[in-house]
């Protein structure tokens, strides 16, 4: 008689990352009997929801269901029907919704209500939709990359199973860049974390971690650009803004009402004698860099050292994984290689920003002009943020690893979020039989 394969004893989990510019759905899978082991959960699917972030649906909340349909249907297809009812679904909203909540708690609640109702219509075990804090976003990103890199495993290996692995148990720091916020999270070396708001204590797999984290709201790449435009238009002599962060020959009309729509530009708001202005690109990296630096207030620091805006930042320690928009932007610019020095990156950015807009459009015909036009700003912003904001240097640049995926799973906060909510990160090192669930993070 033929041997029949035993049915796979696996579990699934779904996390939706409702970011400021888009929503992505991630499906994770793991062997049921090994759920307390480190490194067994992996991503089997990413579905990018077609359209903008959920905060954009504030005036048409009844359409959120349509927006989510395609990816939820994809989850229905990927996960075996027999597993649907026991598959947890979590939605975490990040800085786009934090900003909406700052403007109107009622509107933010309404959006989340409709999201919850829409997700409850599917045959999965819906566990709720919420706005996660910046601290959580940083912490879960840190957990994700270190889980995937095998840093929580107590077994020492003489071989490397993942890229970037330095074959020690020293954790990687996490650098996350979104559209509306950016997070920095790492374990400082024997350094007191001077600001309690930035301190996290974890016990994971039998080891204690004192982790520093901070989320800079309004310093994601999209909101940073709005901030820069709002700052620069203050001193423009007329409704023409000659902008070094856009390619020579680039032109775009901006509505002043759009500029002041976000809470991130409130500090620069003023009455202007025009309703619209035109950005005219001049494509100068150095001037763009200078303009960006004006967004970082480094004149005030109540601690031994700061990042910017009076926020404590301990001395940088160890290797860092830079993911999300850090990776996407640098990947587009072809600057993710470990061999590219910071000086070389700066050189390449100078050349890229100076390229005429017509030339850029021809070279990247398949890319939407809105995205394409902003790579000069975004690349320059990443350099400014890492070097002047977080105090990386030409020497420490080599400790930054631009990471998209690790072992097939996207780097980002979603995996860490699910691991925590499904109690899959034990505080103590598991014995051969799983421990009780009483000591989890």
């Amino acid at each position: 008689t033929q041997n029949k394969a035993l049915p796979e004893n696996v579990k699934y989990g779904i996390v939706l990352d409702a970011g400021s510019s888009h929503t992505s759905l991630y499906i994770y899978k793991w062997p049921a009997e090994k759920e307390n082991d480190t490194g067994v959960v992996h991503q089997v699917e990413e579905c990018r929801v077609k359209g903008p972030g959920i905060s954009k649906f504030v005036q048409k909340v009844n359409e959120i269901g349509i927006y989510l349909t395609d990816c939820m249907e994809r989850a229905r297809e990927v996960i075996p029907r027999s597993q649907h009812q026991e598959t947890p679904v979590y939605l975490g909203a990040t800085a786009g919704m934090r900003l909406l909540r700052m403007e109107s708690e009622e509107l933010a609640d309404r959006v989340l209500d409709v999201v919850e109702r829409s997700l409850s219509n599917y045959p999965f075990d819906f566990q709720g939709a919420r706005i996660i804090t910046g601290q959580e976003e940083g912490a879960y990103g840190w957990i994700t990359i270190n889980y995937l890199l095998g840093k929580f495993s107590q077994k020492t290996r003489w071989f490397s199973i993942v890229p970037y692995e330095t074959n020690n148990q020293e954790t990687f720091g996490a650098l996350d860049l979104g559209g509306a916020s950016t997070q920095v999270t790492f374990v400082p070396q024997n350094q007191t974390i001077e600001s309690p708001d930035n301190a996290l204590q974890f016990r994971l797999y039998g080891k204690d971690y004192n982790v520093y984290t901070h989320s800079f709201l309004c310093y994601g790449k999209d909101q940073a650009l709005w901030q820069k435009l709002a700052k620069d238009i203050q001193v423009a002599s007329n409704e023409i803004l000659r902008d070094p962060c856009f390619h020579p020959g680039y032109k775009k009309v901006v509505n002043v009402s759009d500029l002041y729509k976000t809470p991130c530009t409130k500090r620069f708001e003023m009455t202007l004698p025009f309703q619209q202005f035109e950005i005219q690109g001049i494509g100068n990296y150095q001037q763009c860099h200078q303009s960006i630096l004006e967004l970082f207030n480094t004149s005030y620091c109540p601690y031994s050292q700061c990042a910017f805006n009076g926020i404590f930042l301990p001395p940088l320690q160890g290797d860092f994984g830079a993911f999300s928009a850090f990776y996407f932007v640098m990947k587009f610019l072809n600057l993710t290689s470990e061999k590219v020095s910071q000086e070389k990156v700066t050189e390449m950015m100078k050349k890229f920003c100076a390229q005429p807009w017509e030339e850029i459009k021809t070279s990247y015909a398949g890319v939407k002009e809105k995205y394409l036009s902003e790579y000069c700003f975004s690349g320059t912003y990443i350099l400014s943020l890492l070097l002047q904001g977080y105090h990386f240097t030409a020497d420490s640049w080599e400790h930054i690893h631009f990471i998209g995926k690790i072992q097939g799973s996207d780097a980002g906060w979603t995996l860490g979020y699910m691991l925590n909510l499904t109690n899959m990160i034990p505080a103590e090192q598991p014995l051969s039989t799983p421990l009780s669930h009483s000591t989890y993070v």
Partner: antibody, heavy 121, light 106 residues
Framework: EVQLQQSGPELEKPGASVKISCKVS????????LNWVKQYNGKNLEWIGN????????RYNQKFKGKATLTIDQSSSTAYMHLKSLTSEDSAVYYC??????????????WGQGTTLTVSS | EIVLTQSPAIMSPSPGEKVTIACSAS?????MHWFQQKPGTSPKLWIY???NLASGVPARFSGSGSGTSYSLTISRMEAEDVATYYC?????????FGAGTKLELK
């Protein structure tokens, strides 16, 4: 403005194969699923399947599995549908199209002009 | 798959008359979309998400319904409304269309 430009009419013999193209402009190619629809007798509309240029993932209507293969060429922002083992039943107008929400959460739905396929000996 | 049944198949209203086209789904769908197609042209999105008019669609058109029963209504038929109208569901795969309702002028 989103535009979908399809290849011209095709006349094929039974048993042959054909590849219809759909070139997209005016938006980022990886942002939306590209759908294919068959219209025969100038009336009945049937969804064939779609491809997600972001992930490369495809979905097919069971009825067209083995008949249609959907692919993309990201460098030229072009989607293709390959139809094989053609019979007279495949004579129809084929449309590519995409729909979804733009950056301002406005719903849109755009179709190519259609490609007429005639299968005849 | 979800089967959509449209009725009637053909309709010949007089100008100014109220027109209602029905679309019934074999199982519940969250939303219904409607397309207008004129001979020799591609289908055009006419109503999306049950009741929202696509850009440029005259206000005499409206859509309603829920679950398995949906409809498109023209408050006062005009000559330019002569076309075939299709319902479509995008709630589950495979996406499906109704067989169409052809509107002619009496």
């Amino acid at each position: 403005e989103v535009q979908l430009q399809q290849s011209g009419p095709e006349l094929e013999k039974p048993g042959a194969s054909v590849k219809i193209s759909c070139k997209v402009s005016g938006y980022s190619f990886t942002d939306y699923n590209l759908n294919w629809v068959k219209q025969y007798n100038g009336k009945n509309l049937e969804w064939i399947g779609n491809i997600d240029p972001y992930s490369g993932g495809t979905r097919y209507n069971q009825k067209f599995k083995g008949k249609a293969t959907l692919t993309i060429d990201q460098s030229s922002s072009t989607a293709y549908m390959h139809l094989k083992s053609l019979t007279s039943e495949d004579s129809a107008v084929y449309y590519c199209g995409l729909y979804g929400y733009d950056d301002d959460a406005n719903y849109f739905d755009d179709w190519g002009q259609g490609t007429t396929l005639t299968v005849s000996s | 798959e979800i089967v959509l049944t449209q009725s009637p198949a053909i309709m010949s209203p007089s100008p100014g008359e109220k027109v209602t086209i029905a679309c019934s789904a074999s199982s519940s769908v969250s939303y219904m979309h409607w397309f207008q197609q004129k001979p020799g042209t591609s289908p055009k999105l006419w109503i999306y998400a049950t009741s929202n008019l696509a850009s440029g669609v005259p206000a005499r058109f409206s859509g309603s319904g829920s679950g398995t029963s949906y409809s498109l209504t023209i408050s006062r038929m005009e000559a330019e409304d002569v076309a075939t109208y299709y319902c479509q569901q995008r709630s589950s795969y495979p996406l499906t269309f109704g067989a169409g309702t052809k509107l002619e002028l009496k």
